[in-house]
């Protein structure tokens, strides 16, 4: 459910890549959630996507237990005690061995019909 | 102040299914998780699943992929726990809680206060 | 899914003893990780949660330590209260998982 009321997020990024974890950034109004909702999905796997939550005062977290060399869909909601937040999402990479390790990678974060490449 | 009231004991026949409500009272429902956590009798506790109500999607423990279904009614604050082909070694308590770090941040868990499902011919 | 291997299974002690219950992940895990105590007949208590915050109530000697895969909980001078069961909760990437429980009997 999303509504006019919740304040929607700001953007997203991949701040570091691995070949098995990520750290994601984000920005959001302060205190205006109670938690942040984020799904990992594998792209072009029909695999459940992996849910976490993250507590609404931080704007970063490490994702582990992620496969080397694979694209991953990252989306990320604030929830509030009665609504949800549109969805933004960013695409990943993960790097394919230990050299790669927090080298650069393309993300692509979207809300709605908005579009952005970082570099 | 966080209730958790479960629905009561249940006697089931291998094959069966059976399914436990757990109603949320004295806060908000749809926002933060439940878990469903079973005990079997002088065993472990072992973390079933669990599903946010806002988003109505529930995760499983892989060893009851498959068997067991969590949903949650937002009208009524309820969440269920169903688990299917039953068993003996089902026969356990099984406790729907709001447990930290899943979708929940306060500074106290909630458990209900347990439901005994007995698996017998 | 992750798992937590929890160690030992049972110990001894005696009151006044310092104990240390380790739980180690199957991989890095996010430090959403909640130790809790049992009694029978009761339904568990969180004791610490975050790896190493004390749940409010909790007396000081319990203590919670480690990151990444492995945990610790310390209990600095054992009291007559304390002898139960302690598992450790990962609950911070989905599906959680409980360790197997440790359970400390009196010596």
């Known amino acids: 459910a999303s509504t006019g009321e919740t304040p929607n997020l700001g953007e997203v990024v991949v701040a570091e890549v691995g070949w098995d974890a990520l750290k994601l950034n984000w920005t959001a109004p302060e205190g205006a959630y109670e938690y942040f909702f984020i799904q990992v999905q594998e792209a072009d796997t029909v695999e459940a996507a992996q849910n976490l939550t993250v507590p609404g005062g931080l704007r970063s977290t490490d994702l582990p237990g992620l496969k080397a060399a694979t694209h991953y869909t990252i989306t990320i909601r604030g929830v509030t005690q009665d609504f949800s937040t549109t969805p933004l999402s960013v695409e990943v990479l993960t790097a394919s061995g230990l050299n790669d390790i927090f080298e650069a990678q393309k993300i692509e974060w979207h809300e709605g019909t908005h579009h952005h490449h970082h570099h | 102040q966080v209730q958790l009231v479960q629905s009561g004991a249940e006697v089931k026949k291998p094959g069966s299914s059976v399914k436990v409500s757990c109603k949320a009272s004295?806060?908000?429902?749809?926002?933060?998780?439940i878990s469903w956590v079973r005990q079997a009798p002088g065993q472990g506790l072992e973390w079933m699943g669990g599903?946010?109500?806002?988003?109505?999607?529930?995760n499983y423990a892989q060893k009851f992929q498959g068997r067991v279904t969590i949903t949650a009614d937002k009208s009524t604050s309820t969440a269920y726990m169903e688990l299917s082909s039953l068993r003996s070694e089902d026969t356990a308590v099984y406790y729907c809680?709001?447990?930290?770090?899943?979708?929940?941040?306060?500074?106290?868990?909630?458990w209900g206060q347990g439901t005994t499902v007995t698996v017998s011919s | 899914d992750i798992q937590m291997t929890q160690s030992p299974s049972s110990l001894s002690a005696s009151v006044g003893d310092r104990v240390t219950i380790t739980c180690r992940a199957s991989?890095?895990?996010?430090?959403?990780l909640g130790w809790y105590q049992q009694k029978p007949g009761k339904a568990p208590k969180r004791l610490i949660y975050?790896?190493?915050s004390l749940q409010s109530g909790v007396p000081s000697r319990f203590s919670g330590g480690g990151s990444g895969t492995e945990f610790t909980l310390t209990i600095s001078s054992l009291q007559p209260e304390d002898f139960a069961t302690y598992y450790c909760?990962?609950?911070?990437?989905?599906?959680?998982?409980f360790g197997q429980g440790t359970k400390v009997e009196i010596k």
């Open positions: 809680a709001r447990l930290y770090g899943y979708a929940y941040y306060g500074a106290f868990d909630y």
């Open positions: 004295g806060g908000t429902f749809s926002s933060y998780a």
């Open positions: 599903i946010i109500p806002i988003f109505g999607t529930a």
């Open positions: 991989q890095g895990i996010r430090n959403v």
């Open positions: 975050d790896a190493y």
């Open positions: 909760l990962q609950n911070g990437l989905q599906p959680a998982t």
